[in-house]
């Protein structure tokens, strides 16, 4: 007698490992024999799909090599035309041993930056990821964390973070280890011992000593008055990532000697500089045909503005040049009672660099004036209102004594950088922060279409002097 189909063994949840065989059984009783079809996630499985084997008149469905993507709900439907079609469903849960899909790679990182070592995993159940440094499990702390993705994040990388790392992915089915990778921590060049200035007699021998460190170990070069050292002997030694350089000189003229420590980080370099002046005892008394002499700035007003150990021109038309020029800057400042925060650092730098001009040492020491373009930028962009006040007071003779003549440079009389870039001095960059920029003079547009990063604002609201290191 005809009999409607009945599924005698309903489908069950099947657990299967990747690359293994998984079988669903759908036993059916009926007469006549039913047609049995299979679906995965409600999509019909085609009889000719070579990834599957359908046997026993359709009652057995075998997945020949389980893949991660085979997860889902499998249903069999039986129909023989007698009564309605019947259906039974079961789930396939693909289990997978841990697998590291994106292993960590060797990393070189600069001290203080953030390092991320990737370790992306697959597996079911989801593997837990831990890390090993050297031979020991890595402990997480406020700086070191294993992210949800399995990657290792190290904030503010320190020298001691350098070493060999590997990640471990673990679930109930097994454990996977990544290959060992190296984290190398690089450190900017830094000067540990700066050369000292000397005041010596003509024909003396002087040894300048400079010590620097960094990872990789920096190289040290010596510069004499802006050029590579042409004479003198250099001795170097390296021990425990510290380089020690000694420059021995036979002194026949005064000069500014700069020790430059440089190391390379990928395509970029970091540099640290320290300078010392060599002055000759009798040279400090200017010769009659000189209008001044070079000396290290020792005042206070321009301390934050002029580069450390800067050689400045002291004008001998004053009885006491240092005191007179210092008073000159002081006086100019006292006359500017209200100065905007945008103008102040620019005006400070301009006045200091104008009154204490950079000095080019030599038989006839020469002052190096500020480049006209930098003067104009201060005058018209940063200090437009204040400049008018200064010029007005200068013309009306409101400055005490006659020292005001030097206070405000006449930009048009200064040399242009286009004529000879070495004949004039640039003003260093302003340390601007966004707060200052809100009050910037509306020279051009009411809606500035510019992106200015947050630069560190200088504590003395002045121009920044060369940092200990710079990236070039």
């Amino acid at each position: 007698l005809p009999k409607a189909p009945v599924i005698t063994t309903p489908l069950e949840t099947v657990d299967a490992l990747v690359e293994e065989v998984a079988t669903f059984m759908c036993a059916v009783e009926s007469y006549p024999q039913p047609e049995i079809s299979w679906t995965r996630n409600k999509i019909l499985i085609k009889l000719f799909d070579t990834r599957y084997s359908i046997r026993e008149n359709g009652q057995l469905l075998t997945i020949l090599s389980v893949e991660d993507s085979d997860d889902g709900i499998y249903c069999c439907t039986a129909n023989n035309g007698v009564g309605g079609a019947v259906e039974s469903c079961g789930a396939l849960q693909v289990k997978m041993k841990p697998k590291i899909t994106r292993p960590p790679i060797n990393v070189k990182i600069i001290e203080g930056l953030k390092a991320v070592l990737p370790c992306t995993t697959m597996g079911n159940p989801k593997p837990s990821v831990s890390w090993i440094k050297g031979d020991s499990p890595l402990r997480e702390n406020s700086r070191i964390a294993v992210l949800e993705s399995g990657s290792l994040r190290i904030h503010n990388v320190q020298k001691e973070d350098a070493g060999q790392y590997r990640c471990v992915a673990k679930n109930s089915l097994g454990t996977a280890y990544s290959k060992v990778v190296k984290l190398e921590v690089e450190v900017f060049a830094r000067i540990l011992r700066a050369p000292e200035s000397h005041n010596v007699t003509f024909g003396s021998f002087v040894t300048l000593h400079c010590t620097a460190t960094g990872i990789p170990v920096p190289t040290i070069t010596w510069i004499e008055n802006g050029n590579a050292v042409s004479s003198g002997s250099i001795q170097e030694s390296v021990k425990d990532r510290v380089i020690d350089s000694r420059l021995q000189l036979f002194i026949t003229k005064p000069g500014l000697y700069t020790c430059i420590a440089t190391n390379k980080h990928g395509e970029k370099f970091s540099t640290a500089k320290a300078a010392a002046t060599i002055s000759i005892a009798e040279w400090s008394k200017p010769q009659k045909d000189n209008k001044g002499y070079c000396a290290q700035y020792r005042g206070e007003v321009c301390n934050a503005v002029l580069a450390k150990d800067a050689l400045v021109f002291l004008n001998t038309s004053y009885a006491d040049p240092e005191e007179a020029q210092e008073l000159l800057v002081h006086t100019a400042w006292n006359e500017l009672k209200v100065v905007s925060p945008v103008c102040r650092p620019a005006a400070e730098a301009l006045l200091c660099n104008h009154i204490f001009q950079e000095c080019s040492p030599g038989v006839v020491p020469t002052p190096i004036p500020i480049c006209r373009e930098y003067c104009l930028a201060v005058k018209e962009l940063f200090c437009a209102k204040e400049w008018l006040v200064m010029e007005e007071k200068t013309h009306r003779g409101l400055y005490r004594s006659e020292m005001h003549l030097l206070s405000v440079p006449e930009c048009s009389k200064l040399p242009s950088m286009h004529w000879d870039p070495t004949a004039c001095a640039r003003l260093p960059h302003l340390d601007y922060n966004k707060e200052n920029l809100k009050t910037f003079p509306p020279m051009t547009s009411s809606k500035p279409s510019v992106d200015i990063p947050n630069l560190p604002s200088s504590s003395s609201s002045s121009f920044s002097v060369s940092p200990t290191y710079s990236m070039t």
């Epitope: 006209r372 373009e373 930098y374 104009l376 930028a377 018209e380 962009l381 940063f382 048009s412 242009s416 950088m417 286009h418 640039r426 960059h429 302003l430 601007y432 910037f440 020279m443 051009t444 547009s445 500035p448 279409s449 510019v450 992106d451 200015i452 990063p453 630069l455 070039t472």
Partner: antibody, heavy 124, light 107 residues
């Protein structure tokens, strides 16, 4: 000798993208300001964008804001102009030019060196 | 935004003539104004920067001056090679504006 060489121009459909390069030699991009200026056929000069690498600051003309991005790779001594959502009115010869100094001072030096220009045509 | 209105848009002159081109800024600006010469198919060339400074290698017959918001380029004695288009350009801290250009043609 200072030289600027532009590349990357060509024909692109409206809505498309192009990236122009400006390779500099004889000076360092990091100590200068780099500008892109364009000139539509038979028209005058129009400033497009500027970058001052020492500050990392950038600025754009209103007509390209939000569509164009100026950048510089100081290690390659090259500046770039990424142009997205291109329109027919962006058709022009694009010049890159440099000026001395940083953002605040560069204006006083003028654009002293220019490239030969690269033609960008936006047409369907 | 600041507009730089350049006049005249074109002029005809003879060799030896004195030529004056003016740019007027729509509001108070700095002296960061430059003048350029451009010949067909070529990139512009810098002539004057900072309103009145002559760029190196530029003949002394070219000069620039400023009076308030008016900027002037003067060619004291026009030469055959001076027939070209001239542009003024103003630089602010945030943006740059060019004048529309003045075409100097042979009369």
């Amino acid at each position: 000798e200072v030289q600027l060489v532009e590349s990357g121009g060509g024909l692109v459909q409206p809505g498309g993208s192009l990236r122009l390069s400006c390779a500099a030699s004889g000076f360092t991009v990091s100590s200068s300001s780099i500008h892109w200026v364009r000139q539509a056929p038979g028209k005058g000069l129009e400033w497009v964008a500027s970058i001052s690498s020492s500050y990392g600051s950038t600025s754009y003309a209103d007509s390209v804001k939000g569509r164009f991005t100026i950048s510089a790779d100081t290690s390659k001594n090259t500046a770039y102009l990424q142009m997205n959502s291109l329109r027919a009115e962006d058709t022009a010869v694009y010049y890159c030019a440099r000026s001395e100094g940083d953002r605040y001072v560069s204006g006083y030096f003028g654009l002293d060196y220019w490239g030969q220009g690269t033609l960008v045509t936006v047409s369907s | 935004d600041i507009q730089m209105t350049q006049s005249p848009s074109s002029l005809s002159a003879s060799v030896g003539d004195r030529v004056t081109i003016t740019c007027r800024a729509s509001q108070s600006v700095s002296s960061a104004v430059a003048w350029y010469q451009q010949k067909p198919g070529k990139a512009p060339k810098l002539l004057i920067y900072s309103a009145s400074s002559l760029y190196s290698g530029v003949p002394s017959r070219f000069s620039g001056s400023r009076s308030g918001t008016d900027f002037t380029l003067t060619i004291s004695s026009l030469q055959p090679e001076d027939f070209a288009t001239y542009y003024c350009q103003q630089s602010g801290v945030w943006l740059i504006t060019f004048g529309q250009g003045t075409k100097v043609e042979i009369k």
